[in-house]
């Protein structure tokens, strides 16, 4: 395929990436699947500028990002290294809290009302943000 030169309709461009902001809620796995079906992924935050950009667009609303530890260590959905990467957890987070009474701990990360991150139960129906890179080859067949 050819490289995308602009973002799809209803997506927002920022520094060569395209972002789509949901206005409804889904469990983390459903949000993850939604983004994949759009040839995108849940947002991966790699810098303070990207953090501020996303925070500005979502407002003070709990919103899923592409970070989870469902298989042990924390991982970004696009393979970005977590250990050496940008982190913006709230104080004392992540805490894998078991006291919510919903079974298990907290394995999925979300933006909180002030933009900082928290881990929470992946089944909670939060809003989400999809991201795709403009410079990656689009999956659409070339025009003949």
């Amino acid at each position: 395929g050819s490289e995308r030169t602009c973002c799809p309709v209803n997506w927002v461009e920022h520094e060569r990436s395209c972002y789509w902001f949901s206005r409804s809620g889904k469990a983390w796995a459903d949000a993850d699947n939604y983004c994949r079906l759009e040839d995108a992924h849940l947002v991966v935050v790699t810098s303070w500028e990207e953090q501020k950009f996303v925070q500005h667009h979502i407002g003070p609303v709990n919103t899923w990002m592409g970070l989870h530890d469902q298989n042990g260590p924390w991982k970004w959905v696009d393979g970005t290294d977590y250990e050496t990467g940008f982190k913006n957890w709230r104080p004392e987070q992540p805490d894998d809290w078991y006291g919510h009474g919903l079974g298990g701990g907290e394995d999925c990360a979300h933006f909180t009302d002030d933009g900082r991150w928290n881990d929470d139960v992946c089944q909670r129906p939060y809003r989400w943000v999809c991201e795709t890179e403009l410079d990656k080859a689009s999956q659409e067949p070339p025009l003949l």
């Epitope: 060569r16 303070w48 500028e49 982190k87 913006n88 900082r116």
Partner: antibody, heavy 117, light 107 residues
Framework: EVQLVESGGGLVQPGGSLRLSCAAS????????MTWVRQAPGKGLDWVSY????????YYADSVKGRFSISRDNAKNSLYLQMNSLRDEDTALYYC??????????WGQGTLVTVSS | DIQMTQSPSSLSASVGDRVTITCRAS??????LAWFQQKPGKAPKSLIY???SLQNGVPSRFSGSGSGTDFTLTISSLQPEDFATYYC?????????FGGGTKVEIK
């Protein structure tokens, strides 16, 4: 290893011009925003300018607006600061810095600009 | 412009001491605050970003806290290599602004 090496500093008369360069290595330059910061002798730190990775967003401190111009060449892994109409108060050590987790994650060692008649 | 006020401007401490430096912003900056360490003749080094996240490779004796207007850098047990000048810096708004610095000296 991240490396930032500034050059182009020197002695210049008031009203003169200089072009500073910052050569970057050890990381993918085109995927990072960059900044210039300066430090007058014996003084604190003073932000000068910011440029986003695609050059689409640029900011300047009020003290240099209209006189300084920031630019970058991603193909050459280089950052630049064109300084015109230099004043005595522009005398400082000029640092370039990589912006990632904060605006100034990694710093070069600086290049000294002296404005004097 | 947002003014960043650090206190104290200098302090004397001994190896092993717990040291606390405060930084106050003239208006709220959320958690967009960084801390830097600078030794004489050297470039500054980033220690903390977004108020409390530790930069890669920075020893865990350094910690940051705060949000809004009041922030703190704490060194839990001062080491010989920690004697330096420390700066806070806000990046919630342009222009980006630094505090005036806190010089940590040997007692």
């Amino acid at each position: 290893e991240v490396q930032l090496v500034e050059s182009g500093g020197g002695l210049v008369q008031p009203g003169g011009s200089l072009r500073l360069s910052c050569a970057a290595s050890g990381f993918t330059f085109s995927t990072y925003s960059m900044t210039w910061v300066r430090q007058a002798p014996g003084k604190g730190l003073d932000w000068v300018s910011y440029i986003s990775r695609s050059s689409s967003t640029i900011y300047y401190a009020d003290s240099v607006k209209g006189r300084f111009s920031i630019s970058r060449d991603n193909a050459k892994n280089s950052l630049y600061l064109q300084m015109n109409s230099l004043r005595d108060e522009d005398t400082a050590l000029y640092y370039c810095a990589r912006s990632a987790f904060s605006p100034f994650d990694y710093w070069g060692q600086g290049t000294l600009v002296t404005v004097s008649s | 412009d947002i003014q960043m006020t650090q206190s104290p401007s200098s302090l004397s401490a001994s190896v092993g001491d717990r040291v606390t430096i405060t930084c106050r912003a003239s208006q709220g900056i959320s958690h967009y605050l960084a801390w830097f360490q600078q030794k004489p003749g050297k470039a500054p080094k980033s220690l903390i970003y977004v108020a409390s996240s530790l930069q890669n490779g920075v020893p865990s004796r350094f910690s940051g806290s705060g949000s809004g207007t009041d922030f703190t850098l704490t060194i839990s047990s001062l080491q010989p290599e920690d004697f330096a000048t420390y700066y806070c810096q806000q990046y919630n708004n342009y222009p980006l602004t630094f505090g005036g610095g806190t010089k940590v000296e040997i007692k």
